[in-house]
Interface confidence: low
Amino acid sequence: VTGSRVYPANEVTLLDSRSVQGELGWIASPLEGGWEEVSIMDEKNTPIRTYQVCNVMEPSQNNWLRTDWITREGAQRVYIEIKFTLRDCNSLPGVMGTCKETFNLYYYESDNDKERFIRENQFVKIDTIAADESFTQVDIGDRIMKLNTEIRDVGPLSKKGFYLAFQDVGACIALVSVRVFYKKCPLTVRNLAQFPDTITGADTSSLVEVRGSCVNNSEEKDVPKMYCGADGEWLVPIGNCLCNAGHEERSGECQACKIGYYKALSTDATCAKCPPHSYSVWEGATSCTCDRGFFRADNDAASMPCTRPPSAPLNLISNVNETSVNLEWSSPQNTGGRQDISYNVVCKKCGAGDPSKCRPCGSGVHYTPQQNGLKTTKVSITDLLAHTNYTFEIWAVNGVSKYNPNPDQSVSVTVTTNQAAPSSIALVQAKEVTRYSVALAWLEPDRPNGVILEYEVKYYEKDQNERSYRIVRTAARNTDIKGLNPLTSYVFHVRARTAAGYGDFSEPLEVTTNTVPSRIIGDGANST
């Protein structure tokens, strides 16, 4: 069981003799008289497992100590940190020639984690370890240990694991700590890209290229890459990620915009306060919701204030000229905060008796310069019917008018066009024909164009050919023409008159009076 010790973030420990609870139980050769496991206490009353050897009096020492199998965990290069004490031969009397001040470090790669014996010829020498002058003093109760630290590396490794071995050739040594580790570039976040734990390369100069993945709520701008150096340091960041819409960078993370803020696009910008007349109620808003009665047009940027439809145009003035009308008005008091204001004209033809009964004017009416999308505040409307009630509405519209469910931004005016001469009468009928009279009836003109004041009937004998005619006037739509000659063909024309004058005569109606004292009832345009 291994207890936890704190080491640099870029080092991954594979073996730490100081963290082993209980005896290490490494294999020594020879089994006795060479390396011996000794436990000492450090200043915190914690046992330190050491291996010691001090056969400085006897010549030709060859004492081996081998660790347990150490897994490689995918590392190609490992580091061995040895903390040890080494007695100065000068401090030991009578050992000249047999005392040594170095030991040798070996390794052996193996897929077998249960090798029981030390076969010296399998091991590859890493280095000869000597005590240098740099040491630390460790207080172990009433004694001070001068602790040397040496680090060596070995690689590339390829098998599943390896064994380390320490060869003593006649020194007085205490191995206080053996730590085996590999280096990695630790998980890190740069430019909003997360780079995973990455084991360093096989040799001390290699760089491992690593592609980063964007942190939560972000996306790539340029492919994020970094290089993992042999010492476990990240080098040369390239590319970056940007926080998604609705998120901003805070402490190396993409955090949701706070309530009342938003971010519309994936950029490196921070969240912005909601524009005027808008709000957000959730964190992470990509746009702000418009206040009630305010809207955002399709092509409005999220950064634009929400706007309103305009109020009604002001001061609508009409000028009637026979069957045309000129309208002028002033801009609305409130444009809704937008520049794209225009005007639409709605024309309704209304009954004289009941102004509420209005119908659209239809396609016969013409507007100058146009009916909809007017940028000016005047319009001329022509080809109206005479003597007719019209209601004209001027609607102020802008880019958000279409979103308003209850539009009230119009002003209206009702006008009556001037009277004009009526149109001609389409149908004249002889209702009754006798020897001396003809009873006529007709329809009102299609377009009276005003109040019909009277009708005028012009008639003459057919063979006189209008050289000698008579006129009869009546307010009704029928009349009896008396005093005619029997058995004579007459031609009748009827026209209507308004205050504006007479209309055109109707098409001629030819009727022949009878010879006998009986009555002929007629219905057609020509009765004989």
Partner: antibody, heavy 124, light 107 residues
Framework: QIQLVQSGSELKKPGASVKVSCKAS????????MHWVRQAPGQGLKWMGW????????TYAQGFTGRFVFSLDTSVSTAYLQISSLKAEDTAVYYC?????????????????WGQGTTVTVSS | DIQMTQSPSSLSASVGDRVTITCRAS??????LAWYQQKPGKAPKLLLY???NLADGVPSRFSGSGSGTDYTLTISSLQSEDFATYYC?????????FGQGTKVEIK
């Protein structure tokens, strides 16, 4: 038919734990966040917080952290409220209620569907 | 946190009466307000949302008005089934708090 069906009443001793379930049906569970509301006897309604049914991330209102845990089992469209170390003042009716997880066109939030409520009584 | 203050806390009325309940927020909640009806032993039922919008299936005698901090629920002609407790709730930034409730009782 859209409904939230809650587990039945619970009688617990102080210090015990309780887990209230809220099973959703008639709609896509992950389209709506699930909220929890407490109503103590004779009292008004108090919003406890909510859980994101897509990510499982809970958000707790002040006063409902520590002993209260919101969780989900999306495979059975069910949200859970667990209360540990129960106290007498936890005696209340607990309601679940749904709210759209995203805008879906609505510019305003409201609890349109509620569970029938689960009565939790804590008494020695 | 935003506080919601309802008034009155209770009222007595007769069938056919016009009843008005008010709800005041401690700051502008921009119409992010819902009204609920709760009958004894039952879950709350949504009446109105966005201050004025009638929820599906709710009779038209219920209406809402208001903006900024002051909101009103009106029952134009009280019916026997309307005797209940009414709550307002804001949705303007968490925590979403409720009013303390208004109990409408039979006179």
């Amino acid at each position: 038919q859209i409904q939230l069906v809650q587990s039945g009443s619970e009688l617990k001793k102080p210090g015990a734990s309780v887990k209230v379930s809220c099973k959703a049906s008639g709609y896509t569970f992950t389209d709506y966040s699930m909220h929890w509301v407490r109503q103590a006897p004779g009292q008004g309604l108090k919003w406890m917080g909510w859980i994101n049914t897509e990510t499982g991330e809970p958000t707790y209102a002040q006063g409902f952290t520590g002993r209260f845990v919101f969780s989900l089992d999306t495979s059975v469209s069910t949200a859970y409220l667990q209360i540990s170390s129960l106290k007498a003042e936890d005696t209340a009716v607990y309601y679940c209620a749904r709210i759209p997880l995203y805008y879906y066109g609505s510019r305003y939030w409201y609890f349109d569907v509620w569970g029938q409520g689960t009565t939790v009584t804590v008494s020695s | 946190d935003i506080q919601m203050t309802q008034s009155p806390s209770s009222l007595s009325a007769s069938v056919g009466d016009r009843v008005t309940i008010t709800c005041r927020a401690s700051e502008n909640i921009y119409r992010n307000l819902a009204w609920y009806q709760q009958k004894p032993g039952k879950a709350p039922k949504l009446l109105l949302y966005a201050a004025t919008n009638l929820a599906d299936g709710v009779p038209s005698r219920f209406s809402g008005s208001g903006s900024g901090t002051d909101y009103t629920l009106t029952i134009s002609s009280l019916q026997s089934e309307d005797f209940a407790t009414y709550y307002c709730q804001h949705f303007w930034g968490t925590p979403w708090t409720f009013g303390q409730g208004t109990k409408v009782e039979i006179k």
